[in-house]
Each structure stands twice: as C-alpha cells, then as structure tokens.
C-alpha cells in the first residue's frame, strides 16, 4: 500500500492522529491519550484497481477486470479507496463498574489502503 506524499492522487494511506480528548472519550479511555488511526484517500482508476497488489482482495481484482471491459453488471461500479490491512491496538479503559479493563481492540489502525 502507498503512503500519501502529496505528489499523487491515487489511493494511499494518509497519516491521521486521533486524540480521544478531541472526541470526548478521555473520560472513559485511560490510555493511550490518542493514536495514529490513519485513513485512506485517493482515486482508484481502472488500471490501479485491477492490479492485485493494490486491491482489497483477489476478488476485487477479478471484478475490476470485468469492470474495465465494460461487462454488466459491473460497468458502472466505482472502485473505492478503502483499508486493506488493519491492526489491533491495546486500550485501557473504565467499564460500567469503574473497573480498569485492558483489551486488544481489533481494526483500530489503518496500515494499508487499496482499491475495492
């Protein structure tokens, strides 16, 4: 997956830091105070969407080959820039009984982006 560098507008991962204070969650999340969640941004032109290395899955690659050839029902489908690899992250937070919970929360960090 590409890292966004401002030079290209094709699908890439953009760095983004989430502060739990900014979204009002710092009253129940103990730690971390924030993290690099990141997000996906950019275009998914046909020649990119049909490349297996930059696609969400093999399925996406196959479907995009049909789309590129104008086959129904895929001709009008638009490929989107979406997360293709996510990571978990440990969090410390208070439960309803004010007990401290440590939990590994799945799909917290976008690590790679690709075309759907």
């Amino acid at each position: 997956g590409l890292e966004c560098d401002g030079k290209v507008n094709i699908c890439c991962k953009k760095q983004f830091f989430v502060s739990f204070k900014d979204i009002g969650w710092n009253d129940w999340i103990i730690a971390p105070s924030g993290y690099h969640a990141n997000y996906c941004e950019g275009e998914c032109p046909s020649h990119i969407a049909g490349t297996s290395g930059s696609s969400l899955s093999f399925h996406s690659t196959v479907i995009n080959h049909y789309r590129m050839r104008g086959h129904s029902p895929f001709a009008n489908l638009k490929s989107c820039c979406v997360p293709t690899k996510l990571r978990p992250m440990s969090m410390l937070y208070y439960d309803d009984g004010q007990n401290i919970i440590k939990k590994d929360i799945q799909n917290m960090i976008v690590e790679e982006c690709g075309c759907s």
Partner: antibody
Framework: EVQLVESGGGLVQPGRSLRLSCAAS????????MHWVRQAPGKGLEWVSG????????GYADSVKGRFTISRDNAKNSLYLQMNSLRAEDTALYYC????????????????WGQGTTVTVSS | DIQMTQSPSSLSASVGDRVTITCRAS??????LNWYQQKPGKAPKLLIY???SLQSGVPSRFSGSGSGTDFTLTISSLQPEDFATYYC??????????FGQGTRLEIK
C-alpha cells in the same frame, strides 16, 4: 508459550563493541514495542532502550545515548542491541522484554521478560 | 525525566503479615504506574499495571492503589514465596521509562 531468549553477551574490553540479540516466539512480535532493560550486579533495574512495533518510535536512556542502537527485524521475530564504546559501567545482566500494550506509538511497561544475557566490560 | 522513589528501601516481615510498599513520582503520572517482583537470579515479573490492575495469574493478595504522585503496593497476607525485591515503574512520560530503586522484602 510466550518466550524471549537473549544471546550475544560476553566479556569485552572497554571501548569495544558487542551486539545482543533477542529471539521472540509465542506472540505476534510485530504488534508490540520491545525493550532492553539492564541490571548491574547487586543493583536495581535500569531501562536501556525501547523500540515501537513499527520502529517509528525509539528511545534511549541518557547513559547509553549515542553509543547504543536498538533495532528489530519483524520478519525474523528478533530484537537487537548494538553496543559501541563500551564502558565498565555497562557491565550488567541485559534483559529483553515485551511491552504490555499492542501497537502503541510509545512505551508502557513489560509483561514478558527473557532470562537475560551477561555483559562484562573489563580489561 | 520523572524520578521514582520507593520506601522503604528494605523491610522485614513475617509470613501472614500485611505489607505496604510506597512509590512516589517526582510529578503527577496519573495512573501510569506498574509494579514488578523480582526474586534472586530470576527475571522480573509484572504484578500490577495501571496502578491497580492485577496482571493475569498474579494472586489476589497483591493489590495496587494510588493516582497522581503517590502509589502503594499491598500484600494482604505474606506468603513464603513473596520474599523478593519489588520495583515500581512509571510510563506516563516515555521515553525514558523509569524504575524506582527497589524495595527488598526480607523474612523477619
């Protein structure tokens, strides 16, 4: 079973170099920050260095800054400590340790420790 | 850097005693405090994280409390296997991670 095994320690003369290694198994190595912590004979614990899961954040104790370099190879599930310009005061048991928190950008603490490798700096 | 000071440096107690070890931070560290136990010739073992959360597999006679600058580790009823050295460690401002100097718990 979660396991950390250190190697590379030994007797070395002042000013020389040594490279410590730590082999990890039993957990998803690239999800966790890793640390080196040392303990001089009869003394307490001293944090030496830490490296985040993606090597994006690296830190050193003032006592080793500029002389020691921490690195990791996630493909090999391995942690390293390159120690240059060694001094007598670097003599210690060096522990490799796993961070408690997964995929954090900074360091929290250690929940798994190796048994340590001994470094002796003496002429 | 944040300094951690433990007291006492050493203490003698008997099996069955209730023991309290104190750790003080040079500035507020919220609840970013961990406690470790180390027995002679062994690697340290995590007991408590986030000031009061018991690490999995650690007996319930161990408990931690405190927030800000003052923290305590309490052993409610000392067992023979509890005689060891105990360290506190802050993770509020890292790097560097800093440990207390240790408290040696001996048999009376």
């Amino acid at each position: 079973e979660v396991q950390l095994v250190e190697s590379g320690g030994g007797l070395v003369q002042p000013g020389r170099s040594l490279r410590l290694s730590c082999a990890a198994s039993g957990f998803t190595f690239d999800d966790y920050a890793m640390h080196w912590v040392r303990q001089a004979p009869g003394k307490g614990l001293e944090w030496v260095s830490g490296i985040s899961w993606n090597s994006g954040s690296i830190g050193y104790a003032d006592s080793v800054k500029g002389r020691f370099t921490i690195s990791r190879d996630n493909a090999k599930n391995s942690l390293y400590l390159q120690m240059n310009s060694l001094r007598a005061e670097d003599t210690a048991l060096y522990y490799c340790a796993k961070d408690i928190m997964g995929n954090w950008d900074y360091f929290y603490g250690m929940d798994v420790w190796g048994q340590g490798t001994t470094v002796t700096v003496s002429s | 850097d944040i300094q951690m000071t433990q007291s006492p440096s050493s203490l003698s107690a008997s099996v069955g005693d209730r023991v309290t070890i104190t750790c003080r931070a040079s500035q507020s560290i919220s609840s970013y405090l961990n406690w470790y136990q180390q027995k002679p010739g062994k690697a340290p073992k995590l007991l408590i994280y986030a000031a009061s959360s018991l690490q999995s597999g650690v007996p319930s006679r161990f408990s931690g409390s405190g927030s800000g600058t003052d923290f305590t580790l309490t052993i409610s009823s000392l067992q023979p296997e509890d005689f060891a050295t105990y360290y506190c460690q802050q993770s509020y401002s890292t790097p560097p991670i800093t440990f207390g100097q240790g408290t040696r718990l001996e048999i009376k």
